[in-house]
């Protein structure tokens, strides 16, 4: 603790100029004071001034008023500083002395004589209010007042609380009269060192280093840091926790960029063709006759179906076609013949059979030839006999199918299972997909072939909804949800009436 006992001398009256021993001062009593402050004593005794002592210079002769003086010699009020907790009680001895010597330091002069003394004992609380008193004896009167105040930066009823106002990163506060801290606006905490963030700033996801600020932690955004940041590249999805990509209805895939309802959203198929939500691009167009192209946007030539028979040549017209028939044939498609077997109409060794009592004929063609007159060599690939993208090749009298990887059989109709050689380690489940086998891994493993043991089981927190099965190892986030029928989304959280497909990657 630290404080100051202050004594203000106001007036001293010694009209007859007498000393305590009854003698008079010549030419008058040149008066100075000695003050002794000590702990409370029921009976004041001589001894050390435990709380401090002070002397004044000569303040006047006989009777005089003492003016306030703030500096230099003769300071008034008198200051008695202490460096301890103020006990609330005290004893004070004020002595008036006459000196024949030096005005400024009279206590050092020989021959000083006591004029009078007063003793005050009692209690005194710390405070700014002056306590005024007056003491009389037969010869003198002293008017004075006194108080105890705390030193700068000390507070409380005993001046025991140290408090220094500050405004830096260890505190932003002023001091209350009791020494407690009063935080400056925008600051809080025991030491007023914690800023009060922008109102509404999310407690966990945001913070601040100065008042009315809201700085977002990684994965969060917005003025109040209450909006999660979805996975980078998330197209048609949202998040409830950072880096998530929960697909909007009708969208799928890791980045929610696969349109599950492309047909409805975009109507890509033209010219009355049928659209189905399937295929590598998310949709397939089935064209009406006379149209071709990925979107059935290309009108076929009217002659594309080879409508002219018996070697007739086809000419496209605006909305139809016209057949130019060879000699001996007539009709819209040159289907009627004016020839008979007598005209040897069958080529390439075809045998002629008469019909309608010899008014027409029919050719029976040898292998590898076709047409009304066996005039066409058979292209065994025209019927697209090769399945699953196989390539058809004419080989003499026969044809062969060259199959894509993963398929076999005469017509590439048989699927070779990539999973047959069990490529998935650690009990992973194998899926035959168009681009090769894919493994879904049991908990604790990841990697293309479930070959990597992971220390953190991403499925442990149960991230999949609606009864979906959780697998690890199929994505950067280390888990996938295999949705049951009727649910989609990275965590199978969206119900849709869509057929089941390969598991959504979370």
């Amino acid at each position: 603790g630290s404080g100051i006992f202050q004594l203000r001398l106001q007036e001293f009256v010694n009209q007859r100029g007498m000393l305590a021993n009854g003698q008079s001062c010549e030419p008058g009593c040149r008066t100075f004071f000695r003050i002794c402050l000590k702990h409370f004593q029921a009976t004041f005794s001589e001894g050390p001034c435990t709380f401090g002592n002070v002397s004044t210079p000569v303040l006047g002769t006989n009777s005089f008023v003492v003016r306030d003086k703030n500096s230099g010699s003769g300071r008034n009020p008198l200051q008695l500083p202490f460096n301890f907790t103020w006990p609330g009680t005290f004893s004070l001895n004020i002595q008036a002395w006459h000196t024949p010597g030096d005005d400024l330091r009279p206590e050092t002069s020989p021959g000083n004589s006591l004029i009078s003394q007063i003793i005050i004992q009692g209690s005194l609380a710390v405070g700014k209010i002056w306590r005024t008193d007056e003491q009389n004896d037969t010869l003198t009167r002293l008017s004075y007042s006194y108080r105890v105040i705390c030193s700068d930066n000390y507070y409380g009823e005993s001046c025991s609380r140290l408090c220094k106002k500050r405004d830096d990163h260890f505190g932003h506060y002023e001091c209350q009269p009791d020494g407690s801290l009063s935080c400056l606006p925008g600051w809080t905490g025991k030491y007023c060192d914690q800023p009060i963030c922008l109102s509404g700033c999310h407690e966990q996801n945001g913070y601040c280093s100065k008042p009315d600020e809201c700085i977002c932690r990684p994965g969060w955004q917005g003025r109040l840091c209450n909006e999660c940041i979805p996975h980078n590249g998330c197209r048609h999805g949202t998040c409830s926790i950072p880096w998530q990509c929960a697909c909007d209805e009708g969208w799928g895939g890791l980045f929610c960029d696969q349109d599950l309802n492309y047909c409805t959203h975009h109507s890509p198929c033209k010219n009355g063709s049928t659209c189905s939500n399937s295929g590598p691009k998310g949709y397939t167009c089935t064209c009406l006759p006379g149209y071709t192209g990925e979107h059935c946007e290309l009108g076929l030539s009217k002659c594309a179906s080879n409508p002219c028979r018996n070697g007739g040549s086809c000419k496209d017209q605006e909305n139809s076609y016209h057949c130019l028939c060879p000699p001996g044939y007539y009709g819209q498609h040159c289907e009627h013949s004016t020839l008979t077997c007598a005209d040897s109409p069958c080529f390439n060794g075809g045998s002629c059979r008469e019909r309608n009592q010899g008014s027409s004929y029919a050719c029976e063609c040898p292998p590898n030839f076709t047409g009304s007159n066996c005039e066409k060599k058979v292209d065994r690939c025209t019927s697209n006999p090769c399945a699953n993208g196989g390539q058809c090749q004419n080989r003499g009298p026969s044809r062969t199918c060259r199959c894509r990887p993963g398929f076999t059989g005469t017509h590439c109709e048989l699927h070779i299972s990539d999973c047959a050689r069990s490529p998935c380690a650690h009990g992973g489940t194998c899926h035959d997909l168009e681009n090769g086998p894919v493994c879904t891994c049991p908990a604790g493993f990841s990697g293309r072939r479930c070959e990597v043991r992971i220390t953190h089981d991403a499925c442990a927190s149960g991230p999949c909804f609606n009864g979906a099965t959780c697998y690890t190892g199929l994505s950067p986030n280390n888990f996938v949800c295999n949705c049951p029928y009727g649910f989609v989304g990275s965590r199978c959280e969206f119900p849709v009436g869509l057929p089941p497909s390969f598991p959504w990657v979370a």
Partner: antibody, heavy 121, light 106 residues
Framework: EVQLQESGPGLVKPSETLSLTCTVS??????????WGWIRQPPGKGLEWIGD???????YYNPSLKSRVTISVDTSKNQFSLKLSSVTAADTAVYYC?????????????WGQGTLVTVSS | SYELTQPPSVSVSPGQTASITCSGQ??????VSWYQQKPGQSPVLVIY???KRPSGIPERFSGSNSGDTATLTISGTQPMDEADYYC?????????FGSGTKVTVL
């Protein structure tokens, strides 16, 4: 008991950047009661405060060094770091990291053992 | 910039009292810490908040601070107290160390 340990190269060439890391053990760097400071002492001279950082990343620098100093914190590693760019021979000193306690009104109650960094070509 | 001034050296006989001053403008309005540093060692906090001792610091170390001067007092000085002593205060957000005082125990 809290311990601080400075680490980094002991020799840096003039005009290059001095980089030091302080690893805190026995306590969390994310406590709200502490700032984490860097102080240096040239050979035979007194202490000079460089700057400090709070776990949230708030930094305070000595104005005489501010243009060259960067202090950063990595709460996941319980570390904080000092970078001092464009060094000269005058930056040769023992560099200390220390914990500054709010409760102690900014007094530094724990110090690293210090690491001598010499700037020389 | 704010400066703290200390006497370069103070000599004291064993068992006597050593007083080290630290002066700065209105220093009494700031909290002062004192550090002891022995050769080849890191500084050790001996006084904080003007006059408080951390646990483990002997009672012979005391501090005061008023006006423009803070004082570290070592009463009953022992040979082991021979060291450099630094005062430290905060001027707004900047830490400021005194120039240091070498205490020699004669």
């Amino acid at each position: 008991e809290v311990q601080l340990q400075e680490s980094g190269p002991g020799l840096v060439k003039p005009s290059e950047t001095l980089s030091l890391t302080c690893t805190v053990s026995g306590g969390s760097i994310s406590s709200s009661s502490y700032y984490w400071g860097w102080i240096r002492q040239p050979p035979g001279k007194g202490l000079e405060w460089i700057g400090d950082i709070y776990y949230t990343g708030s930094t305070y620098y000595n104005p005489s060094l501010k243009s060259r100093v960067t202090i950063s914190v990595d709460t996941s590693k319980n570390q904080f770091s000092l970078k001092l760019s464009s060094v000269t021979a005058a930056d040769t000193a023992v560099y200390y990291c220390a914990r500054e306690d709010v409760i102690l009104r900014g007094g530094s109650d724990y110090w690293g053992q210090g690491t001598l960094v010499t700037v020389s070509s | 910039s704010y400066e703290l001034t200390q006497p370069p050296s103070v000599s004291v006989s064993p068992g006597q009292t050593a007083s080290i001053t630290c002066s700065g403008q209105r220093l009494g309005d700031k909290y002062v810490s004192w550090y002891q540093q022995k050769p080849g060692q890191s500084p050790v906090l001996v006084i904080y908040e003007d006059s408080k001792r951390p646990s483990g610091i002997p009672e012979r170390f005391s501090g005061s601070n008023s006006g423009d001067t803070a004082t570290l007092t070592i009463s009953g000085t022992q040979p082991m107290d021979e060291a450099d002593y630094y005062c430290q205060a905060w001027d707004r957000d900047v830490g400021v160390f005194g120039s240091g005082t070498k205490v020699t125990v004669l």
